[in-house]
């Protein structure tokens, strides 16, 4: 069960000790001395860390990827884990490290000179391949956005919402991610209500602009719960 | 190194709105956790609100549920803080606030280890 999975204290690829470097006194900016942080310490050990339950791998830090604790485990207990360092075994971008990139079932190295053609060949390969599998999981993956020299424009082949140009988000697009239309107000959008109904998204919808979000259109909450037409409007 | 540089607040009539905005430099804004806080004279400093580096996420304190609007635009380093039917007792100085986010974990619990100067927030009544 998923409280068996969060209550364990023997859970594999934990992070180290969260919590860093205090700010440099006289920079521009540092961090406020002596502030406590609500609902939990400032500093937090592996004794009482916890894996954070997650639906899609946004949820998840960058160094993290959301998937079954357990091989072939229950697809509805979810939770952030570790990311896969250089040469470990991968199903998808998200579960390489922030500098990698899952080619062939292994995380590699970006390199940058070659990074975009490699990429683009394995959206290739994917479309193609009778054998690629929506694995259920979102396509997100911590590689970096400096990665790209532009910003891609609509239509452009992305990894995450940063590598996309204003007014654009990366969204799934077939096995593949693209630079979509962020929603504008009115239009049609969709309100997750189930955990981990992201992944099964083949054509997915960017989110809703600044200032809006999903709700139920006004004149369909008499619709059937399924039937019910989400859209952008102002909050 | 992130710096942070908030900008916005102003005088308002209770009632009203205003948008804040955090606007970073340095390359790093996209992997962060950015947070509000807010000080009002007197008191200490209060979360106000969270949210994660790819805007999946966000949390808020009871105080602002329903009326403030945390989001972030990571291809324009700027996180934002739509405030609305604002109230005398939000008035404070506003913080924004940025930690790295490897490591998911509740919203109110990061460690934030950059901050900006704050910007003022006025209701008057």
């Known amino acids: 069960t998923l409280n068996s999975v969060l209550n364990s204290n023997a859970i594999k690829n934990l992070p180290p000790p969260l919590g860093g470097a205090a700010g440099h006194p006289g920079s521009a900016v540092s961090a406020a001395p002596g502030i406590l942080y609500p609902g939990g310490n400032k500093y937090q050990t592996i004794d009482n860390y916890q894996p954070y339950p997650c639906a899609e791998d946004e949820e998840c830090g960058t160094d993290e990827y959301c998937a079954s604790p357990t091989r072939g485990g229950d697809a509805g207990v979810q939770i952030c884990l570790a990311c896969r360092k250089r040469r470990k075994r991968c199903m998808r971008h998200a579960m390489c490290c922030p500098g990698n990139y899952c080619k062939n079932g292994i995380c590699v190295s970006s390199d940058q000179n070659h990074f975009r053609g490699e990429i683009e060949e394995t959206i290739t390969e994917s479309f193609g391949n009778d054998h690629s599998t929506l694995d259920g999981y979102s396509r997100r993956t911590t590689l970096s956005s400096k990665m790209y020299h532009t910003k891609g424009q609509e239509g452009s082949v992305c990894l995450r919402s940063s590598d996309c140009a204003s007014g654009l988000c990366c969204a799934r697009h077939f096995w593949s991610k693209i630079c979509k239309p962020v929603l504008k107000e009115g239009q049609v959008c969709t309100k997750h209500r189930r955990k981990g109904s992201h992944g099964l998204e083949i054509f997915q919808r960017c989110y809703c602009g600044e200032g809006l979000s999903c709700r139920i259109q006004k004149d369909h909450h008499q619709a059937s719960n399924s039937s019910r037409l989400h859209t952008c409007q102002r909050h | 190194k992130v710096q942070l540089v908030e900008s916005g607040g102003g005088l308002v009539q209770a009632g009203g709105s205003l948008r804040l905005s955090c606007t970073a430099s340095?390359?790093?804004?996209?992997?962060?956790?950015v947070g509000w806080f807010r000080q009002a004279p007197g008191k200490e400093r209060d979360f106000v609100t969270a949210?994660?580096?790819?805007?999946?996420?966000?949390a808020y304190a009871d105080s602002v549920k329903g009326r403030f609007t945390i989001s972030r635009d990571n291809a324009k380093n700027t996180a934002y803080l739509q405030m609305n039917s604002l109230k005398p007792e939000d008035t404070a100085v506003y913080y924004c606030a940025a930690g790295r986010d490897r490591y998911a974990r509740d919203l109110t619990e990061y460690e934030y280890l950059w901050w900006g100067q704050g910007t003022q927030v006025t209701v008057s009544s």
């Open positions: 340095g390359s790093a804004f996209s992997s962060t956790v």
């Open positions: 949210i994660n580096w790819s805007g999946a996420r966000t």
